[in-house]
Interface confidence: low
């Protein structure tokens, strides 16, 4: 069956530049402003856009060691990002995957407030295991708001434009890094 | 903690090949690539290349492509570099690193010097 | 490929003095959509693995005294030791390493006048 769980959460960051760190830069800022709950993020294959995969590896201490992330849409117009988890994690006998939206919409304050939904796709007529959905959003809630804290205190990360330029890299923009761009267009 | 551990000094003869390894432990080995970097004699740092220990998808230094190849034991926990065709400029001290979660260099290897001499 | 340049090849200066070390790149090193420049700088001794120091240009290494600081952006970086101490003598790198292949400057030697 399909389980949907849909929550909404605040922030005082604005939508894009929250998109910009949360979502585009998660990777690399995660294990950086919440070791505690990641220890590393590895691009496995793709450049960033759809079908990508994601290693995203806990620390000891954590329940699961590691889960698989399958990017499926970054709409960077609308803060618009899709991905599912397929692999690792409590993936396994009963649960199939877990389908994950997030659109973050700014509000009149400044601030932004993100839609989350989660489907957790089981197998048979297996339930959803509510302590699983609870510490999920934990985590999510943990991340989010480590992310928030270093955007305050560093007030000029990631507010400008500053995408490295097509000229500077003699290619394609460049959002992820070197050998994940490697990964993608040499194999 | 993290530590990188390589083999020991390596004397070879103009034409042959030299395999470095590198031995890593104190984090799982699957989730950070390692990166070879080279020294000769009085000289600066070079980087050679990089391997994926999760896949071991490679990226070569333009300059050393064609004769160097990088391998990994996911069951050992070890990075290997192969250099083919040595020759006398070859003769460096190698090194292996391996990036953080945020890719700077941030854990090395003590080096393995390969002297390269008729 | 991205040349990183460093300016003075060596300097020698007086213990207690500042010391400082600049590197210019040939292109940007900012990564991604982020304001951090992707820029290490490593402090080698003699029979030694090169050891970080700052990354991001200006964040400091776990462990490393406060007297090193890092400062720069776009394509112009300074490494500055406000108070050379002995045990600072060595052989100073920047790299990039937002770009494969990530390259070093050529080094700067720092010795005591």
């Known amino acids: 069956g399909v389980f949907n769980y849909e929550t909404e959460t605040t922030s005082v960051i604005p939508a894009a530049r929250l998109f910009k760190a949360f979502i585009l830069d998660g990777d690399n800022l995660f294990p950086k402003v919440a070791p505690q709950a990641i220890s590393s993020v590895e691009n496995i294959e793709g450049n960033g856009g759809p079908g990508t995969i994601k290693k995203i590896s806990f620390p000891e201490g954590l329940p699961f060691k590691y889960v698989k992330d399958r990017v499926d849409e970054v709409d960077h117009t609308n803060f618009k990002y899709n991905y599912a988890v397929i692999e690792g994690g409590p993936i396994g006998d009963t649960l199939e995957k877990i389908s994950n939206e997030i659109k973050i919409v700014a509000t009149p304050d400044g601030g932004s407030i993100l839609k989350i939904s989660n489907k957790y796709h089981t197998k048979g007529d297996h339930e959803v295991k509510a302590e699983q959905v609870k510490a999920s959003k934990e985590m999510g809630e943990t991340l989010l708001r480590a992310v928030e804290s270093y955007l305050l205190a560093h007030s000029d990360a990631y507010n400008e434009q500053k995408l490295i330029s097509e000229e500077d890299l003699g290619g394609e923009q460049k959002l992820i890094s070197e050998e994940d761009l490697h990964h993608h267009h040499h194999h | 903690q993290v530590q990188l551990v390589q083999s020991g000094a390596e004397v070879k003869k103009p034409g042959a090949s030299v395999k470095v390894s590198c031995k890593t432990s104190g984090y799982t080995f699957t989730n950070y690539g390692i990166t070879w970097v080279r020294q000769a004699p009085g000289q600066g740092l070079e980087w050679m290349g990089w391997i994926s220990a999760y896949n071991g998808n490679t990226n070569y230094a333009q300059n050393v492509q064609g004769r160097v190849t990088m391998t990994t034991d996911t069951s050992t926990s070890t990075a290997y570099m192969e250099v083919r065709s040595l020759r006398s400029d070859d003769t460096a001290v190698y090194y292996c690193a391996r990036r953080s979660s945020m890719l700077h260099f941030q854990h090395w290897g003590q080096g393995t010097l390969v002297t390269v001499s008729s | 490929d991205i040349v990183m340049t460093q300016s003075p090849d060596s300097l020698a200066v007086s213990l207690g003095e500042r010391a400082t070390i600049n590197c210019k790149s040939s292109q940007h090193v900012l990564y991604d959509s982020s304001n951090e420049n992707y820029l290490a700088w490593f402090q080698q001794k003699p029979g030694q693995p090169p050891k970080l120091l700052i990354y991001?240009?200006?964040t400091r290494e776990s462990g490393v005294p406060d007297r090193f600081s890092g400062s720069g952006s776009g394509t112009d970086f300074t490494l500055t030791i406000s108070s050379l101490q002995a045990e600072d003598v060595a052989v100073y790198y920047c790299?990039?390493?937002?770009?494969?292949?990530?390259?070093f400057g050529q080094g700067t030697k720092l010795e005591i006048k």
């Open positions: 790299q990039q390493y937002s770009s494969a292949p990530y390259t």
């Open positions: 991001w240009a200006s």
